[in-house]
Interface confidence: medium
């Protein structure tokens, strides 16, 4: 089955620059299928823009200005690229790639979509670092004692743009856990968001990860915030014992035996 | 030109109570097009639900039913037993892939219908209230309450800033909420909640403990061997950007 990944959840540009949006095709050979690009402007219907067929033929929707969009595909990386030239305010939209997933029986074809890339146009000069800054909250003793469950909370602040994806996993598992989140909120020129995960008592002794996808993450990869395993009694954290082998190492919250 | 028009912009549904979305075609016969339904959830993910005839996306067949009313030129999508997972924007779209008439393999979309999910009517439930702290940050966690109306107050004399609470449906079909704030005196912050004409305090849930309750790290986590607790994630979180937590009793 065909699967589409759009690695950029957002792409921030200043006016008149060029935006390049990527779509990675897996589960199907890109040179044996057509890739379609759609646009969803705020408050408007999702609209077909352009497609590139298995033989490289490009088809544009009528009414789309020529020279605005360029579509390409690179079989070696199984990637289709939509290039938007000379970006302007009316290009602000979420752009989706899509393909028809062939099935055996007549009519049994479905069009699957990538997760979308939001094109953001800004005239602001922002701080050098507008990646999400995490703060973690561990379960309260009262909750673990009374409810035999614990809630982890992952707060992300001072990021731009507002497009962010957060999910949770146990340390050695790829299963995405059911979590809950607040709306993304504006704070001055940046944004904040929080997500929380409630786990049963039996899972509290497992390490959990809050995984954050954002355009301005360092090196363009997902940021993982580690929540250490805990026991269902009083937990004492000592900031002096954080584990940081070098400036590139991950966050660690070390459990220590500090009594009152 | 054809146009797909949803019956409603927003449809509130209750958990477990069947709901129907309708989408009418203007300017052409709906029988000349394949109708598709998609759901867009938080984070823009567009998931395929249904396509004529009897084609369902993974996990949708048991809880969704797509149909066409030719006489009324309508596409219909029934959500048989809505759950909180079904919240999102629903789109109808059409194409004529592989069929007679004007061949088009592009999808023509209608505007979305926003489906909001509410818990079904149930006996009133008092919340549990817990406070979580880290540095100047305080979170008030309010769990498993019904109905939705609630006021959450973080009680402090030295407020820096507060944020609007997030109120969501809990997996059990009640509500959960979290309110965040920043305070200079975070250690003394408590949370009080007004719900159903009653006040509930976080202090009501505090557990009395003495030092014998404190737990050593697990045997495998020796504080002198930090490497055992360090993990290389896909990306690095710089420790200077992280508010480390200190809970002492």
């Amino acid at each position: 089955a065909g699967h589409l990944e759009q690695p950029q959840i957002s792409s921030t540009k200043t006016l008149s620059k060029t935006a390049r949006l990527e779509c990675v095709v897996s589960g199907i050979t890109i040179s044996a299928t057509s890739v379609y690009w759609y646009r969803e402007r705020p408050g408007e219907v999702i609209q077909f823009l352009v497609s590139i067929s298995y033989d490289g033929t490009v088809r544009k929707e009528s009414g789309i200005p020529s020279g605005k969009f360029e579509v390409d595909r690179i079989p070696e990386t199984s990637t289709s690229t939509l290039t938007i030239h000379n970006v302007e305010k009316q290009d602000i939209a979420t752009y989706y790639c899509a393909l028809w997933e062939a099935q055996q029986e007549l009519g049994k074809k479905i069009k699957v979509f990538g997760p979308g890339t939001k094109l953001i146009i800004t005239d602001k000069q922002l701080d050098a670092d507008v990646s999400p800054k995490p703060t973690i909250f561990l379960p309260s003793i009262a909750e673990t004692k009374l409810q035999k469950a614990g809630t982890y909370l992952c707060l992300l602040e001072k990021f731009f743009p507002d497009v962010i994806k957060i999910h949770w996993q146990e340390k050695k598992s790829n299963t995405i856990l059911g979590s809950q989140e607040g709306n993304t909120m504006k704070t001055n020129d940046t944004y904040m968001k929080f997500s929380w995960l409630t786990v049963p008592e039996k899972s509290l002794d497992k390490e959990h990860r809050c995984i954050v996808r954002h355009e301005n993450n360092k090196n363009g990869v997902d940021q993982e915030i580690i929540f250490p395993p805990i026991k269902t009694d009083v937990i004492t954290m000592d900031p002096k014992d954080n584990c940081s082998k070098d400036a590139n190492d991950t966050l660690l919250l070390q459990l220590t035996n500090t009594s009152a | 030109a054809i146009e797909l028009v949803p019956e409603h912009q927003t449809v509130p549904v209750s958990i477990g109570v069947p709901a129907t979305l309708r989408c009418s075609m203007k300017g052409e016969a709906i029988g000349n097009y394949y109708i598709n339904w998609y759901r867009k959830t938080q984070g823009n993910t567009m998931t395929f639900i249904y396509r004529e005839k009897d084609i369902y996306g993974p996990g949708f067949k048991d809880n969704f039913q797509g149909d066409i009313d030719i006489a009324k030129n309508l596409a219909v999508l029934k959500i048989l037993a809505p759950s909180e997972r079904d919240e999102g924007s629903y789109y109808c779209a059409c194409d004529t892939l592989g069929m007679g008439g004007e061949y088009t393999d592009k999808l023509i979309f209608g505007k979305g219908t926003r489906v909001t999910v509410e818990p079904r009517s149930q006996p009133h439930t008092k919340p549990s209230v817990f406070v979580m702290k880290n540095g100047t940050n305080v979170a008030c966690l309010v769990k498993e309450f019904y109905p939705k109306d609630i006021r959450i107050n973080l009680v402090s004399s030295k407020k820096i800033t507060e944020f609007d609470p997030a109120i969501v449906i809990s997996p059990s079909g009640k509500y959960n909420a979290v309110k965040l704030g920043k305070y200079e005196d975070s250690n003394s912050v408590t949370c009080s909640v007004q719900h159903d004409n009653k006040t509930v305090h976080s202090t009501d849930f505090e557990v009395k403990t003495d030092s014998t309750d404190h737990v050593k790290p697990k045997e495998t986590e020796n504080t002198k061997q930090p490497s055992k607790s360090c993990h290389k994630p896909k990306a690095i979180v710089h420790t200077e950007k992280v508010n480390m937590m200190s809970l002492t009793v």
Epitope: L106 | A29, N32, A71, K72
Partner: antibody, heavy 119, light 110 residues
Framework: QVQLVQSGPGLVKPSETLSLTCTVS????????WNWIRQPAGKGLEWIGR???????NYNPSLKSRVTMSVDTSKNQFSLKLSSVTAADTAVYYC?????????????WGRGTLVTVSS | QSVLTQPPSVSAAPGQKVTISCSGS????????VSWYQQVPGTAPKLLIY???KRPSGIPDRISGSKSGTSATLGITGLQTGDEADYYC???????????FGGGTKVTVL
Amino acid sequence: QVQLVQSGPGLVKPSETLSLTCTVSGDSIGHYYWNWIRQPAGKGLEWIGRIYTSGSTNYNPSLKSRVTMSVDTSKNQFSLKLSSVTAADTAVYYCARSGGNFYWYFDLWGRGTLVTVSS
Amino acid sequence: QSVLTQPPSVSAAPGQKVTISCSGSSSNIGNNYVSWYQQVPGTAPKLLIYDNNKRPSGIPDRISGSKSGTSATLGITGLQTGDEADYYCGTWDSSLSAGVFGGGTKVTVL
């Protein structure tokens, strides 16, 4: 209960125009396609054409030059005109309902009108 | 000559099974849905199968339809004397932009 009631002359002279009407009773014409199908004695079915509520039509290419269909939604009826008839047009003419290219099947039929072309 | 090809006749004893084939091309059966009709002499045709294999309400499950490639098949099990009739297949032809029928098959119960 929806029914299709056919009306029109059973005898038409060669070179003249055959005219038939089909009235939808028990429901509105709705957004269906309304079709005409004929069957010469002892032979198979032949699709003549269809008309949509809006008035758009599709005709069998072999009859296209002689066929005209119309719809009157206010009267809940649709009509067939076949010009320059010959003896080869003698057949039972049926009106029938279908739902479009993806619903090209006839779930409701009129009883049929035998039209004889003879001088 | 019909665009879709059916055998002129098939027969079987009561209680037996008959199958009727209907062959076409990629522009009709190959890319569109097939329907089947029963016509008792002197009456209008009646829809038996639509969308290749679906039965309208009131049609018994001993009537079945299938499609493979550019051919379709109608099956009737537990043959009864009341099944004696002419049977027609039909579909849309994308090249002609027209509806097409088979020439019809007469079913005889021996």
